[in-house]
């Protein structure tokens, strides 16, 4: 059987074959060990008992999607049934005090591949087997440790796998310079070891993306919003939008990128160099929100050019464009476009990202003071608790709720909080009353609500002890 | 002068539903949080449910919770409840009133039999 | 069972002053405003006091709230007979996050 045969249907084209080389993985043609790694269908019998106690999950991701030229990285994590775990030696144990279906174990050892490599023969001084190798029968790397790395891991894509020896997760990057542009598929099959052979445990698979758009997302934040995940915010407070360009292999890390918005409320264009940008609206309504972002990232160098007709001069190299631009889809570094050669085949190229969000401005509350604090005097000559009256402006819409959080002179224990509906008058002016238990300083927050938003006030305030001649004082405010 | 007219009550089924009106005038409708209370026949005041002047917030009693919707429309100057999986016990006499906070202006009421 | 608590009845004499109370808790009648409401017989309620002790306009001033800790209290001084209604606390509970009344008052001149 070849490895084609063994992971997967999905045969890519006689050109991706060609075009996708992945460095350091090695063509599907090749032969697959069946004696040392069996192969089992999808519905095997075999699969129920390959390994102790219940099934081995393998969970696939990466962090996708990728840049072209740039590294993608996946991740399989083992899941292993429940109350087994890993050790530090690689064996396979189970959980103290853990109970399962079986109940609690008296053997500690679900797996123990110690012994049973303590106990191998046929091997030579350097450790080296006829078993200790990979489907293809190349042999195990041996770093320090490698005995305690007891599963194989096969990856395939685009006709090219790669073999890793791993512990129950492992992580493999892969250079998409030569990746086609687009989903592809990447699949991964899981062995472990038993005895001289190899035990299939656990398959999976999992798109990823390849693109030549740079992956931009854009966090919006406003002071005062209620919910910034609605893309809902309020007129005439600054709104803070901060680009991230999703580059978890730092691809970009030396390109100038240069950011371009439009915010669609007819101000024009806005050019930065920051990925960070306030914008205040000014009107109600429904807005286009564009970006668009532009990195110089390395790039696929262009064939050379043919000579040139004699009778015009030849450019000299350092005066050749250094960049092209890139916004057409099919395989990475086939865009015939503004292109250049450099001596040292370090060529540039235009990316870009595009981000677009429809967002709608409101009314909201702006700004919330408290003006005025009153103790309240109550007809019981010595009440143990105190009555505060807390006169409130507002500026913007009208509030629909106070809430009150009292809490200790740091702002940081909360001892009472308290939320009610609110009547306004035009305006914005009101009295929360609120009760203090005891005398002493409070810190107290303030906000106000509506559907929209919510503005926050606070103070410290000093409740004197019930002496009618003590005064209310504002601590701080 | 602030008025509140409440209309569609009448007899219903147990289980069946009413749609109740309350036609404002004499005040700006779309800043005033509204509501309705109920009473049942010799009975006491009891809330039934506020909403916000944007129609944004919306409570409810826990006895109509789920059964009951509460809503506005501003160009009309209406509040409405719509009455779904009606019971005996509700059965009341229905007041429209301005706030929440504090009930300042009363309707005159209209009453919803509930009865088989 | 009303979460505020009202005496159910209330009686006096023609220029006699009265006082009704309504007690609850920290998160009602402690923490926010009491209302009083008057229902004259076959009438809808009308307020009367309102943020504890605020008369509206047009409410005669023999009527007064006050508020101590999680009790408050409606007086009505010189008693009329006009003023034989039922009279509703109410407030704001910010626990059950809903408008909670007293069981009424059924104030009687005799």
């Known amino acids: 059987k070849r490895f084609h045969d063994v992971l997967g249907n999905e045969r890519p084209s006689a050109y991706m074959r060609e075009h996708n080389q992945l460095n350091g993985w090695s063509s599907d043609e090749n032969d697959w060990n069946e004696k040392l790694y069996p192969v089992w269908k999808r519905g095997d019998m075999r699969w129920k008992n390959s390994w102790k106690g219940g099934r081995v999950q393998a969970v696939l991701t990466s962090d996708s999607p990728a840049l072209v030229g740039s590294n993608i990285t996946f991740a399989v994590n083992l899941i292993f049934p429940r109350c087994q775990k890993e050790d530090a030696n690689g064996n396979i144990v189970y959980e103290k005090n853990c109970r399962n279906e079986a109940g609690l174990s008296a053997d500690p050892y679900v797996y123990n591949w110690t012994a049973w490599s303590e106990d191998s023969d046929g091997e030579n001084g350097t450790g080296q087997s006829h078993h200790n190798v990979f489907p293809d029968g190349k042999p195990f790397p041996h770093h320090p440790g490698w005995r305690r790395w007891n599963f194989i891991y096969v990856f395939h894509t685009l006709g090219q796998y790669f073999q890793k020896l791993g512990r129950c997760s492992v992580r493999v990057s892969v250079n998409t310079a030569n990746v086609t542009l687009g989903p592809q598929l990447m699949e991964v099959t899981v062995y472990r070891r038993h005895g001289r052979a190899y035990v299939p445990i656990a398959q999976v698979k999992d798109v990823y993306v390849v693109t030549d758009q740079i992956p931009v997302f854009v966090t919006m934040f406003q002071k005062n919003d209620r919910n910034s995940s609605d893309e809902t915010f309020l007129k005439d407070l600054p709104i803070m939008f901060d680009v991230l360009i999703h580059d978890p292999s730092h691809f970009l890390n030396y390109s100038t990128i240069n950011y371009k918005w439009s915010f669609g409320d007819n101000t024009g264009l806005f050019v930065s160099t920051n990925h960070t940008v306030n914008h205040t609206y000014v009107l109600n309504g429904t807005f286009s929100l564009n970006l668009t972002v532009k990195a110089a990232a390395p790039g696929p160098c262009p064939p050379p050019p043919p000579p040139p007709r004699p009778s015009k001069p030849t450019p000299s190299l350092a005066t050749t464009l250094k960049s092209y631009d890139s916004n057409t889809p099919g395989p990475a570094g086939d865009n015939p476009l503004e292109l250049s050669r450099i001596p040292d085949e370090n060529c540039q190229i235009n990316r870009y990202g595009h981000f677009q969000a429809t967002i709608t401005i409101v009314e909201g509350i702006l700004e919330v003071n408290i003006i005025q604090m009153t103790d309240v005097l109550m007809p019981v000559p010595w009440p143990e608790s105190s009555l505060i009256d807390f006169v409130v402006t507002c500026q913007g819409s009208i509030p629909t709720e106070v809430c009150t959080i009292i809490s200790d002179p740091t702002c940081e224990i909360t001892q009472n909080t308290v939320c009610s509906p609110v009547d306004v008058d035009e305006m914005c002016l009101l009295t929360v009353r609120r009760t203090f238990n005891g005398s002493g300083t409070y810190c107290v927050n303030l906000t106000l609500g509506d559907d929209t938003s919510l503005a926050l006030t606070s103070t410290l305030i000093s409740v004197p002890d019930r002496d009618p001649a003590s005064p209310l004082r504002m601590a701080n405010s | 002068e602030v008025q509140l007219l409440e209309s569609g009550g009448g007899l219903v089924q147990p289980g069946g539903s009413l749609r109740l009106s309350c036609a404002a005038s004499?005040?700006?409708?779309?800043?005033?949080?509204m509501s309705w209370v109920r009473q049942a026949p010799g009975k006491g005041l009891e809330w039934v449910s506020s909403?916000?002047?944007?129609?944004?917030?919306?409570y409810y009693a826990d006895s109509v919770k789920g059964r009951f919707t509460i809503s506005r429309d501003n160009s009309k100057n209406t509040l409405y409840l719509q009455m779904n999986s009606l019971r005996a016990e509700d059965t009341a006499v229905y007041y429209c009133?301005?706030?929440?906070?504090?009930?300042?202006?009363w309707g005159q009421g209209t009453l919803v039999t509930v009865s088989s | 069972q009303s979460v505020l608590t009202q005496p159910p009845s209330a009686s006096g004499t023609p220029g006699q002053r009265v006082t009704i109370s309504c007690s609850g808790s920290?998160?009602?009648?402690?923490?926010?405003?009491v209302s009083w409401y008057q229902q004259l017989p076959g009438t809808a309620p009308k307020l009367l006091i309102y943020?504890?002790?605020q008369r509206p306009s047009g409410v005669p001033d023999r009527f007064s709230g006050s508020k101590s800790g999680t009790s408050a209290s409606l007086a009505i001084s010189g008693l009329r007979s006009e003023d034989e209604a039922d009279y509703y606390c109410?407030?704001?509970?910010?626990?059950?996050?809903?408008?909670?009344f007293g069981g009424g008052t059924k104030l009687t001149v005799l």
């Open positions: 009133a301005r706030k929440w906070s504090t009930f300042d202006y």
């Open positions: 004499g005040f700006t409708f779309i800043r005033r949080p």
């Open positions: 909403i916000s002047h944007s129609g944004g917030s919306k």
């Open positions: 920290s998160s009602n009648i402690g923490n926010n405003y």
């Open positions: 943020a504890d002790s």
């Open positions: 109410g407030a704001w509970d910010s626990s059950l996050n809903a408008y909670v």
